[in-house]
């Protein structure tokens, strides 16, 4: 189950503080990988593989590690200071406006269009009109004559928070 809150949502203004493993809060904040105790006097370590915190913070608990959904691959595991990084499986992508699921990439472009961008974990194939060079909206026509293509190799991992 994916966490619905990220520390980007919650993080207070970050303040520079000396690096330290575990100790009392510095200027009221605990280091990444820790949260503050109920009485605000101690920094308590997050549990490796279970929860994390990415910034100096005064959160009263650590944030839950994201579990990658089926249809996703785990690029890097959750540590006490960094959330799990999940990426859509090859041939699927995640759109910004529907980040909750990976969608299948189209196998080709509609008639009269040419593919200019491969399927990546964060984008569908990109099609443009042969003549004008304008981008296709991404809506697949009901009847489609396609130019088949193989999913592209991602250039870099798509880091998703929460």
């Amino acid at each position: 189950e994916s966490a619905l809150i990220t520390q980007q949502d919650l993080a207070p203004q970050q303040r520079a503080a000396p690096q330290q493993k575990r100790s009392s809060p510095s200027e009221g904040l605990c280091p990444p990988g820790h949260h503050i105790s109920e009485d605000g006097r101690d920094c308590i370590s997050c549990k490796y593989g279970q929860d994390y915190s990415t910034h100096w913070n005064d959160l009263l608990f650590c944030l839950r590690c994201t579990r990658c959904d089926s249809g996703e691959v785990e690029l890097s595991p959750c540590t006490t200071t960094r959330n799990t990084v999940c990426q859509c499986e090859e041939g699927t992508f995640r759109e910004e406006d529907s980040p909750e699921m990976c969608r299948k990439c189209r196998t080709g472009c509609p008639r009269g269009m040419v593919k200019v961008g491969d399927c990546t974990p964060w984008s569908d194939i990109e099609c443009v009109h042969k003549e004008s060079g304008t981008k296709h909206s991404g809506e697949v026509p009901a009847v489609e004559e396609t130019v088949t293509s193989s999913p592209g190799t991602p250039a870099s991992p798509c880091s998703l928070s929460g």
Partner: antibody, heavy 122, light 112 residues
Framework: QVQLVQSGAEVKKPGASVKVSCKAS????????MNWMKQSPGMSLEWIGR????????FYNQKFKGKATLTVDKSTSTAYMELSSLRSEDTAVYFC???????????????WGQGTLVTVSS | DIVMTQSPLSLPVTPGEPASISCRSS???????????LHWYLQKPGQSPQLLIY???NRFSGVPDRFSGSGSGTDFTLKISRVEAEDVGVYYC?????????FGPGTKVEIK
Amino acid sequence: QVQLVQSGAEVKKPGASVKVSCKASGYSFIGYFMNWMKQSPGMSLEWIGRFNPYNGDTFYNQKFKGKATLTVDKSTSTAYMELSSLRSEDTAVYFCGRSAYYFDSGGYFDYWGQGTLVTVSS
Amino acid sequence: DIVMTQSPLSLPVTPGEPASISCRSSQSLVHSNGNTYLHWYLQKPGQSPQLLIYKVSNRFSGVPDRFSGSGSGTDFTLKISRVEAEDVGVYYCSQSTHVPWTFGPGTKVEIK
């Protein structure tokens, strides 16, 4: 706008239990603690404890451990407080109240429910 | 537990006049992080409490600027510069420096 709407008044017999609800709207329910307070007749307020809807953790005032049990239903954005083994001294108005997840800003309640009167009488 | 005391417990006021409520704690409310977690609430007749002031002197949103908070250590004050009829009710101070959080007994403000 932020609203906390509590269930109606209850009359219970000594030894019984009661469950008071607090339905939240107008904000992300999992983004804040839900606290519960007790106000006895003609008395001040006492903080009972709080529930973390994000991870399910509870934190109680030692005085109310074993008396109050805090839960939530995230699907309906509703917090609950169950009071067990009721006695006459549990007669009070109970309030829910929202607080932040941070130590520095988490010790005060920016929004409150309207209160639920629980009367314990034989 | 930290004991909060307030004085006076009852305060008759005249509209347009200033009013002042004192709150004392049994221990210092200065946290080891340097902040002081003392807050004020107003409970109007038949209503739930509402936040007025947090962390000694910060007015909550929508609170009129006639309300102000001050103090340090164990002694705190809530001032109303010019009382209005709508300000009647019970004023509570509260602390969250020490667990469990505790409230004062309340000061009842009523129009003379």
